[in-house]
């Protein structure tokens, strides 16, 4: 999906209002310095591409993020403010349903959510030069 035509300011507002709080809740009890940010993004469409991938695509050691509260709200925000987004997700969701595992918060998931927090922070500061 090409995130170029999304309403970035509304997605940012939704993130600041509630999605960010849900990410913090998920990470509660984890030190903010525990994980190094290894995933980066260069502009807002790129950031949303990476956020979409880390939130909804199962990875080795972390198959369960798509059912978390922050993921549900992320999906809602992208569907509402990115034209045509919800239609592109049908095949991805069917595939994910087949692979879905029991919900377990592993260290790998905590690391992945830490990366997500970094991507969202970068999304919110689009004018910053890439590190």
């Amino acid at each position: 999906y090409d995130f170029t035509n999304c309403d970035f300011e509304k997605i940012k507002a939704a993130y600041l209002s509630t999605i960010s709080k849900d990410l913090i809740t998920y990470m509660s009890g984890t030190k903010s310095t525990e994980f190094n940010n290894t995933v980066s993004c260069s502009n807002r469409p790129h950031c949303l591409t990476e956020i979409q991938s880390l939130t909804f695509n199962p990875t080795a050691g972390c198959a369960s993020l798509a059912k978390e509260m922050f993921a549900m709200k992320t999906k809602a925000a992208l569907a509402i403010w990115c034209p045509g987004y919800s239609e592109t997700q049908i095949n991805a969701t069917q595939a994910m349903k087949k692979r879905r595992k029991r919900k377990v918060t592993t260290n790998k998931c905590l690391e992945q959510v830490s990366q997500l927090q970094g991507l969202w922070r970068r999304f919110n500061r689009p004018l910053l030069k890439q590190q």
């Epitope: 509260m69 549900m72 809602a76 569907a79 509402i80 049908i90």
Partner: antibody, heavy 122, light 108 residues
Framework: QVQLQQSGAELVRPGSSVKISCKSS????????MNWVKQRPGQGLEWIGQ????????TYNGNFKGKTTLTADKSSNTAYMQLSSLTSEDSAVYFC???????????????WGQGTSVTVSS | EIVLTQSPTLMAASPGEKVTITCSVS???????LHWYQQKSETSPKPWIF???NLASGVPVRFSGSGSGTSYSLTISNMEAEDAATYYC?????????FGAGTKLELK
């Protein structure tokens, strides 16, 4: 304007099934999660689950797994909830409720259907 | 699951009286995830207060909400007849979504 129109009251036999509908208009149906909420007579509200019509993704309250099945038909902008193996405990009013970001970007159930009464009786 | 405990369950207030309804949450949640709904008999619930303190469209300014962590409240500064209803708090912090049992507010 956003409207959620639910199907009419149902009187059903114990052990049978019932499917109630919630027809949406005035917004992009595929892009918003749809919730279902149960209210027994004189009681409070109980969340059953939700469906994302765009891809059929669902999340259920564990108390209702096996009892309810949520589906959505994008061609008619309609969400459905099927209740199976009905008992007197299932007699209630069932509401559909869209969830979205309000003007302050808080996420909540912002529009509700008028409710469908289901009475289970022999 | 997160349990929301409302108090009182039932109360009556005279016109002009100040009313406070509380919602105690079993584990701490972000204030952005606590909402209030109003329901009058035989009708569907209406969104009333979003994110602890933000009034929904059309809600009179005599209503206010406050709180954080595990303790939240809805206040009516001057009770009016049209405020007689049942009020529910609800959390959107974790699954399953849960509601308080409701506070029925009657006109004295």
């Amino acid at each position: 304007q956003v409207q959620l129109q639910q199907s009419g009251a149902e009187l059903v036999r114990p052990g049978s099934s019932v499917k109630i509908s919630c027809k949406s208009s005035g917004y992009a149906f595929s892009s918003y999660w749809m919730n279902w909420v149960k209210q027994r007579p004189g009681q409070g509200l109980e969340w059953i689950g939700q469906i994302f019509p765009g891809d059929g993704d669902t999340t259920y309250n564990g108390n209702f797994k096996g009892k309810t099945t949520l589906t959505a038909d994008k061609s008619s902008n309609t969400a459905y909830m099927q209740l199976s193996s009905l008992t007197s405990e299932d007699s209630a009013v069932y509401f559909c409720a869209r969830s979205g970001f309000d003007y302050g970007y808080f996420y909540a159930m912002d529009y509700w259907g008028q409710g469908t009464s289901v009475t289970v009786s022999s | 699951e997160i349990v929301l405990t409302q108090s009182p369950t039932l109360m009556a207030a005279s016109p002009g009286e100040k009313v406070t309804i509380t919602c105690s949450v079993s584990s701490s949640i972000s204030s952005s995830n606590l909402h209030w709904y109003q329901q009058k008999s035989e009708t569907s619930p209406k969104p009333w207060i979003f994110g602890t303190s933000n009034l929904a469209s059309g809600v009179p300014v005599r209503f206010s909400g406050s709180g954080s962590g595990t303790s939240y409240s809805l206040t009516i500064s001057n009770m009016e007849a049209e405020d007689a209803a049942t009020y529910y708090c609800q959390q959107w912090s974790s699954y399953p979504l849960t509601f308080g049992a409701g506070t029925k507010l009657e006109l004295k």
